[in-house]
């Protein structure tokens, strides 16, 4: 026992004085803490704790499930172990079955032995399946045996705690290994669109998709410049063992003009971070803007060509274009086509191609085009000379 | 890096004794394993008993359980092998071999230790 100073509290006094003592099956564990401030007994095997209040701990028929520490606790809570085996050739292993790793962590298969004279204590793989070539571990006859530094390989891994016993290898209870991934890299984050054009009243609803290994992955939809809390709603998978994905919706049933802004989609992960943004801007109503992409006073010689272009903007889409000249209207010699095939587009570009003017054909040409909003209108005005 | 020394080698009758050491220089860890194997001239390097060094489990191979028992001394970071019952099939160089990232899961392979003494002769005449 420890030397302590006089007048100084010391920790209980065990008998038998040994930090481990072994018992066959059947045998009596007979265990005396010595101390006059004596509070309790503390068993643990596993999960399990038991308490006795009585100074001396009697086990009158040991059993395999009586191994483990037992720990005499006095009142000034300073304590004295003794670790029992209760060797028992039918019960080799004390086992908990759940078995969690971390990526690059190490972790215990927990099968602590009843007997710790036995040799060759390993792992197993299960149904005669070979381990991974580089998994390493830890003996501990008490604890079990640490796997080191788990790979995500080991995923579903199944094993048993192996002894030999008599020139016998004897297997525990099975064991599977679940592995949970370490980030190794930022979580991948995209946007159903980029920017959204709405009216006043319509519904806003964007996508965010992040993919990462596990689901433990944060994520949520943030206003710039704002701490409101956005609604959102949440579907997610599992695509096989470490690939995860989650769709985080963002909606907002009816925009008015002061929800304009930047929205960020924003992950993080223990490695990292990542966002995305998207860009609302809702008005009042629709709109539409003509841009002439030449001069709308045009001078052209008689029997020359030349080409009306204009450019507009227009939210909703256009619904009605058309070209007219002296209040008749073009079937042909024009095309109206958006600018770009970007579902967000916006601008559209519209030509009327003249041919061989003549003197006569000079006048006022005019442009209309309509959404279910508004209407608008460009006038060119053609002298041939 | 770590030196191993092997010393304890000799000739020996069938039916006698030996006790092999080898001295670790270097730091040890609680992941470290320590293991003896032997080659025959010819034959492929052979496992023959391993040590973990924080708990003190050992390892044998089948061949000489109940003969060979190994052990440690934490204290002067040496491993012992005593060989009893020597049998002739028992002759070959006796390597040491060590590793600090645990015990393999084939602590049987040679393959799988980083570190390795120069060898010890041990034979046995019948």
């Known amino acids: 026992q420890p030397s302590v100073s006089p007048g100084e509290p010391s920790p209980p006094s065990i008998h038998p004085g040994k930090s481990d003592l072994i018992v066959r099956v059947g045998d009596e564990i007979r265990l005396l803490c010595t101390d006059p401030g004596f509070v309790k007994w503390t068993f643990e095997i596993l999960d399990e704790t038991n308490e006795n209040k009585q100074n001396e701990w009697i086990t009158e028929k040991a059993e395999a499930t009586n191994t483990g520490k037992y720990t005499c606790t006095n009142k000034h809570g300073l304590s004295n172990s003794i670790y029992v085996f209760v060797r028992d050739p039918a019960k080799l292993f004390l086992v908990d079955r759940s078995l969690y790793g971390k990526e690059d962590n190490d972790t215990l298969v927990r099968c602590p032995l009843t007997d710790p004279e036995v040799t060759n204590y390993s792992l197993k793989g299960c149904q005669g399946k070979p381990l991974p070539k580089d998994l390493r571990f830890i003996p501990d006859p008490k604890a079990g045996i640490m796997i080191k530094s788990v790979k995500r390989a080991y995923h579903r891994l199944c094993l048993h705690c192996s002894v030999d016993q008599e020139g016998k290898s004897v297997l525990s209870e099975k064991f599977i290994l679940k592995v949970r991934p370490a980030f190794k890299a930022v979580p991948v984050v995209s946007v159903s669109k980029a920017s959204y054009l709405l009216r006043e009243g319509e519904e806003f609803t964007v996508t965010c998709t992040i993919k990462d290994v596990s689901s433990s992955v944060y994520s949520t939809w943030k206003r710039e410049n704002s701490q409101t809390k956005l609604q959102e709603k949440y579907n997610s998978w599992h695509h096989g063992d470490f690939n995860y994905e989650r769709q985080a919706t963002l909606t907002i049933s009816s925009a008015r003009v002061n929800d304009s802004g930047v929205f960020m989609c924003y992950a993080n992960n223990t490695f990292g971070s990542a966002n995305v943004t998207t860009t609302l801007e809702v008005v009042d109503k629709g709109f539409i803007n003509i841009f002439p992409m030449i001069n709308t006073t045009v001078f052209v010689n008689d029997g020359e060509n030349v080409d009306l272009i204009v450019e507009y903007e227009a939210f909703p889409k256009p619904e009605h274009q058309q070209w007219i000249y002296m209040n008749r209207t073009f079937t042909d010699k024009w095309e109206d086509y958006p600018k770009s095939e970007n579902e967000s587009n916006i601008r559209y570009v519209s030509e009327l191609h003249l041919t061989r003017l003549k003197g006569t054909e000079g006048g006022t040409y005019t442009f209309l085009v309509s959404n279910s909003d508004v209407n608008a209108a460009i006038a060119f005005n053609v002298y041939v000379n | 890096e770590v030196q191993l020394v092997e010393s304890g080698g000799g000739l020996v009758q069938a039916g006698g004794s030996l006790r092999l050491s080898c001295a670790a220089s270097?730091?040890?860890?609680?992941?470290?394993?320590m293991g003896w194997f032997r080659q025959a001239p010819g034959k492929e390097r052979e496992f023959v008993a391993a040590?973990?060094?924080?708990?003190?489990?050992?390892y044998y191979a089948d061949s000489v359980k109940g003969r060979f028992t190994i052990s440690r001394d934490n204290a002067k970071n040496t491993v012992y092998l005593q060989m009893n019952s020597l049998k002739p099939e028992d002759t070959a160089v006796y390597y040491c071999a060590a590793d600090q990232r645990g015990v393999p899961a084939y602590y049987s392979d040679y393959a799988l230790y980083d570190y390795w003494g120069q060898g010890t002769q041990v034979t046995v005449s019948s």
């Open positions: 040590i973990s060094w924080s708990a003190g489990m050992t």
């Open positions: 270097g730091r040890t860890s609680g992941s470290y394993v």
